[in-house]
């Protein structure tokens, strides 16, 4: 958010900028957070938009029976683990073609046991609400997936007639890792030092983050001809004068007409 | 790059015999396996033979006791005897090679290649 300056009082501007905005020769350029000539004033409402995609991580072990095991594929630098990788990837793509989710595979550690392949499946799902029931469904045909391909793809009399055989008993899911995401916790964090004064709404399944200062959700203050505006504190109203009244109160809903204090001040004088 | 290339290939009656040899441009495979691989018009290509560095061979069944897989380190060759030889072993044959200790005959599994010699088994 930048707020332009033009005139004289500019220069003076410059080492004003407030809530480490920076001046740029024009203006103060404000953090996320803030805005205004000197980035004094808070936002109302902060961009948590839930991210495009969602990410899973299956750890999975298998072992690979038609490559014996050297120790040159400990050295993911070699040729022998170049050409492991790429045989074991292909083979993989091969196992996990009919899962939208699927993105591909990534080797951590080969080690010995014929090969035992220590990798990660990679999954993503683009959001929606329903993200974690996708990528639950997702993660369990995995699982039907190699499991199948591990007891079908075996050595007959030691020669395999597949890309690749396997170990039938080799075969195991360690973890699975879904990228959380909480709006809450997005907005409180981005929020900072206002983090307790700042909620999640949602509309049409979108979450916004908003302070009460921003109109049209059940949390809005209403300050009615006063502005909002927020505070290490809270959100407060501060009241307007205009021509006829003074406002006062909490949500500036006390008025009080001028004409009517200035005829009581003459009646003192 | 790795090179292979084949040779030894021909015209040869049924019963009759041949040495296929492959010359590998360097010795980088010495340490993994190499094997012969064919394909005869209209049909996939098939594994033949096997050798792997630490001396294990395997074969297609097709193909046992009739044909021999050697390999030569120190001319950083591979051979394939093939004796009584049938109609049905009329084929374009390759080399192959691959970095690791394979027990595979299945193509998809070896990423070298030579570009093939034409056998053909007929009277």
């Known amino acids: 958010r930048t707020t332009t300056c033009f005139g004289d009082g500019c220069q003076n501007t410059a080492s004003r900028c407030k809530n480490g905005g920076t001046w740029d020769g024009l203006k103060c350029q404000c953090p996320n957070l803030y805005y205004g000539e000197l980035c004094e004033e808070v936002v109302s409402s902060i961009d948590i938009g839930p991210p495009e995609t969602i990410s899973a991580q299956m750890e999975l072990t298998v072992t690979v029976t038609s490559v014996k095991f050297t120790e040159e594929l400990k050295n993911h630098s070699s040729q022998e683990f170049q050409e492991f990788k790429q045989t074991f990837t292909e083979q993989m793509n091969i196992v996990y073609s009919g899962i939208p989710e699927y993105v591909g595979v990534n080797i951590t550690k080969l080690r010995l046991g014929s090969v035992v392949v220590e990798h990660d499946v990679l999954l993503r799902t683009k959001y929606t609400p329903e993200y974690k029931t996708v990528l639950d469904n997702a993660t369990e045909v995995v699982k039907e997936k190699i499991t199948k391909v591990t007891t079908q793809q075996i050595m007959i009399n030691d020669i395999c007639s597949d890309m690749m055989c396997f170990n039938t008993t080799g075969t195991q899911v360690q973890n699975i890792t879904v990228t959380q995401y909480d709006p809450e916790e997005d907005c409180r964090k981005m929020a900072k030092e206002y983090g307790d004064y700042f909620v999640v709404e949602y509309r049409d399944q979108k979450p916004y983050c908003i302070s009460p200062c921003e109109p049209g959700f059940s949390v809005s203050k209403n300050c009615n001809l006063g502005k909002c505006q927020m505070s290490l504190s809270g959100p407060q109203c501060l009241c307007v004068t205009t021509e006829t009244h003074w406002y006062s109160g909490e949500t500036c809903n006390q008025g009080t007409q001028k004409s009517l204090v200035y005829g009581h001040h003459h009646h003192h004088h | 790059d790795v090179q292979l290339v084949e040779s030894g290939g021909g015209l040869v009656q049924p019963g009759g015999s041949l040495r296929l040899s492959c010359a590998a441009s360097?010795?980088?495979?010495?340490?993994?396996?190499m094997s012969w691989f064919r394909q005869a018009p209209g049909k996939e290509r098939e594994g033949v033979a096997i050798?792997?560095?630490?001396?294990?061979?395997g074969y297609a069944d097709s193909v046992k006791g009739r044909f021999t897989i050697s390999q030569d380190n120190a001319k950083n060759s591979l051979y394939l005897q093939m004796n009584s030889l049938r109609a049905e072993d009329t084929a374009m044959y390759y080399c192959?090679?691959?970095?690791?200790?394979?027990?595979?005959?299945?193509?998809?599994?070896?990423?070298?290649w030579g570009q093939g010699t034409q056998v053909t088994v007929s009277s």
């Open positions: 192959a090679a691959s970095f690791l200790v394979l027990r595979a005959l299945n193509p998809k599994a070896w990423h070298y």
């Open positions: 050798i792997s560095s630490d001396g294990w061979t």
């Open positions: 360097d010795n980088t495979f010495s340490r993994g396996s």
